[in-house]
Amino acid sequence: TQNKALPENVKYGIVLDAGSSHTSLYIYKWPAEKENDTGVVHQVEECRVKGPGISKFVQKVNEIGIYLTDCMERAREVIPRSQHQETPVYLGATAGMRLLRMESEELADRVLDVVERSLSNYPFDFQGARIITGQEEGAYGWITINYLLGKFSQKTRWFSIVPYETNNQETFGALDLGGASTQVTFVPQNQTIESPDNALQFRLYGKDYNVYTHSFLCYGKDQALWQKLAKDIQVASNEILRDPCFHPGYKKVVNVSDLYKTPCTKRFEMTLPFQQFEIQGIGNYQQCHQSILELFNTSYCPYSQCAFNGIFLPPLQGDFGAFSAFYFVMKFLNLTSEKVSQEKVTEMMKKFCAQPWEEIKTSYAGVKEKYLSEYCFSGTYILSLLLQGYHFTADSWEHIHFIGKIQGSDAGWTLGYMLNLTNMIPAEQPLSTPLSHSTYV
């Protein structure tokens, strides 16, 4: 039912995050007269769209409209009718669609076209659907968390208590893990960013920021698992893959055609003497970790230092917010506490992975088996990526903060995206020209 009370002097915005594994709709709200203040925008709703990511609709584009209906209807309920026409709607697609575009630009365009037509049917101010770059995804995630932590302004924030010791203006780095890609973004300490592709310069609220960012396509948790399976099946002696990243007693049949469907496994593709193989879990953290490390090429680095695969990475600096799947996985494993050391996380993972599958299913009866079965891999992957990939150490681990929400708003790229596209991040303090969209492209 519509709210008939006097309209508040507020504005709304909607962003759809079309990720590789699912789509989420976020509704943001802010006081109309304080558009250019930092910290005034906050999330009022999240609606998770039922079903997979939009890239999976490539053979059934006619179903996209129905797929988006529930969450768009929810937005209609939450936002007062009087505000509908002036509420902007943006859809940003991330690495799942980047991968589809690599396979076929035509197919990716077809999906986006149907998405746009579906979203145009609603009474909101639809501003378009596009595939955002990995650089944008990293940058907007960094903007989101620092905006919510009040890092861009000395002024009083709209919320009273800011978490994570944010009494200084030193920005947080952003660590984002999705299903198909992962992003690392931070301000390095007095360090030249040796690779221009990884450098962003922008001016926010009167201050200049030189930001490092990189998005590793195919290194999101789901695509990393496909990569690992494709790598390991190469050396399997038959159609049984004894996999240390799954619990002892776990079994699952995988179609080779599914394995090689993604561009992420192309480098491991070979003609196998079988169409299917069976994963048999053996639950060994150490072996799982070793297998994952083989996905990171650390032997080649054309810069002073690299993350992996020859990608420049400056020395880590300051505190980091780790969100999206970094948070969801660690939260499930009960490892998000600031007090849990890296050594303790490793010990817990060893124990968790070694637990028999039947025991795990009983302990977590309410969790879907598909997700439940992959937490051992995902937790081990997170450790491998952070320690070996990004060079966090036992020391710097304590400066990683696993963040789900900050003052009620989800950590992720969507808020930063909307702030930028609605010109709500002024370059100057208090008000001047907004950060141009082209800054990121």
Epitope: T298, P315, L316, S341, H391, T393, A394, D395, H399
Partner: antibody
Framework: SVEESGGRLVTPGTPLTLTCTVS????????ISWVRQAPGKGLEYIAI?????TTYYASWAKGRVTISKTSSTVDLKISSPTTEDTATYFC??????????????WGPGTLVTVSS | AYDMTQTPASVEVAVGGTVTIKCQAS??????LAWYQQKPGQRPKLLIY???SLASGVPSRFSGSGSGTEFTLTISGVQCDDAATYYC????????????FGGGTEVVVK
Amino acid sequence: SVEESGGRLVTPGTPLTLTCTVSGFSLSSYAISWVRQAPGKGLEYIAIINSYGTTYYASWAKGRVTISKTSSTVDLKISSPTTEDTATYFCARGDSYGSGVGLGLWGPGTLVTVSS
Amino acid sequence: AYDMTQTPASVEVAVGGTVTIKCQASQNIYSNLAWYQQKPGQRPKLLIYRASSLASGVPSRFSGSGSGTEFTLTISGVQCDDAATYYCQQGFSSNNVDNTFGGGTEVVVK
């Protein structure tokens, strides 16, 4: 650069403070470690204070030494030196958290002799 | 603790020869290992960081390899100036620094 000072001849039990003075970089961005070397022996790690002011000690040093910092100096206080503490004491700069990328900048060292 | 065991304690090598020094960590330290050179009466000098990255100004005849628990420093085409003691050091955890340096390897150049 980093430079140690305060090394001298002391009698056992006489408290001693060594100072590491830094220039050209900020202690809010880097960690400082203290390392010592007894005559003719190898390097021995003593303690570290990271950019956040968090301190860590080798287990043998806990209770015997204290590391602290100001804006441009890092002190190592040896509360009750024994003859075993005779060594050259070095301070060295690591990365912001510790020595994850090695100790790239070392002072020349300061000699402490403990003798009765 | 992350105990570091360095071998050999001493090695003799002819000018132009190759010397290999090994360092073993008691636990996985990933790539967080540094190598230092120290000459008598001098301060240590960083040669290699993160197991295989050459520090600024270090000649390319020095190279590092390994990850996890096994690491190697190799000096190819040894020169007289390379006579020194070499130390490895784990840079993974400050919380466990009881034996963060290896015992050292003395390289004698003939």
